[in-house]
């Protein structure tokens, strides 16, 4: 059974992941980003279902494509290199979803833009955090 300390740790990790995802979204979804139009042409796979921590497998599998799109951004827009940013996210995702059980991610039929993709995972984090608090 999860202890209060493990719940607190999970909550903090989710909050960290949430802030990282929001920071990426903030860096790209504004008029000053010269590559926004180009970035919006890239398609991301969305989870068919995302209600539990194990579903973070679907986010993990899209981190490489996310890094590739972020590499289009100007360096001034990100005070962390995309590689480092994605690496940080990957570490948190691995800890949160755990490695005990292998989960096969199911994707929705419709693909999404990077903005829709990030918003979906931001909503996921907010939703799980709200159940923990």
């Amino acid at each position: 059974a999860p202890t209060s300390s493990s719940t607190k740790k999970t909550q903090l990790q989710l909050e960290h992941l949430l802030l990282d995802l929001q920071m990426i979204l903030n860096g790209i979804n504004n008029y000053k980003n010269p590559k926004l139009t180009r970035m919006l042409t890239f398609k991301f796979y969305m989870p068919k279902k995302a209600t539990e921590l194990k579903h973070l497998q679907c986010l993990e599998e899209e981190l490489k494509p996310l890094e590739e799109v972020l590499n289009l951004a100007q360096s001034k827009n990100f005070h962390l290199r995309p590689r480092d940013l994605i690496s940080n996210i990957n570490v948190i995702v691995l800890e949160l979803k755990g490695s005990e059980t292998t989960f096969m991610c199911e994707y929705a039929d419709e693909t999404a833009t990077i903005v829709e993709f990030l918003n979906r995972w931001i909503t996921f984090c907010q939703s799980i955090i709200s159940t923990l608090t």
Partner: antibody, heavy 126, light 111 residues
Framework: QVQLVESGGGVVQPGRSLRLSCAAS????????MHWVRQAPGKGLEWVTV????????YYADSVKGRFTISRDNSKNTLYLQMNSLRAEDTAVYYC???????????????????WGQGTTVTVSS | DIVMTQTPLSSPVTLGQPASISCRSS???????????LSWLQQRPGQPPRLLIY???NRFSGVPDRFSGSGAGTDFTLKISRVEAEDVGVYYC????????FGQGTKVEIK
Amino acid sequence: QVQLVESGGGVVQPGRSLRLSCAASGFTFSIYGMHWVRQAPGKGLEWVTVIWYDGSNEYYADSVKGRFTISRDNSKNTLYLQMNSLRAEDTAVYYCARGSYYDSSGYYFGEDFDYWGQGTTVTVSS
Amino acid sequence: DIVMTQTPLSSPVTLGQPASISCRSSQSLVHSDGNTYLSWLQQRPGQPPRLLIYKISNRFSGVPDRFSGSGAGTDFTLKISRVEAEDVGVYYCMQVTQFPTFGQGTKVEIK
């Protein structure tokens, strides 16, 4: 000093078109992004659209997408807003506002919405 | 879109007394460049808006030092240390971290 003067407002029937202008002076217009913001009677502020310093990129609020077009003529220091298929809910005071400036290093600097025009009133009514 | 929520919506104050307006964003306003693009605007009756504060706490040129901004992340505050008659109007918080959005406005009036 920085000055922004809007014109072109008026009363128009639903479905018709109107073109607003914003004449800029007192700064190097051609390096600044520019915004249009509107305010319905007795209501708050709503961002409408923005255009890049050179006109190469433009973005719109969902409420006006496909109906409004922002443009600029840097040789005339003038910003425009072409409004088509007007609706009653487009009734508002329309303000132009200065955005950030584009530096030769390829980045935007400065503050958005640091200077505003006095506004021009658009009334959509049959 | 990022939703900006202001409280209170109306603030009757006594001349010479302090006033405070809160603003909360639906998500973090920290940009990937490290800045937080949260501004405060003042709109006096019958006038266009005017920039008071940018990037949380920086006063725009010509703005009196009785105006100050603070906050971080999603929670921000505008304070007027001693309200003067010319401060009457509506105050808006706005974010330009993503595409711009405004708070609903807070009406400051004299009691």
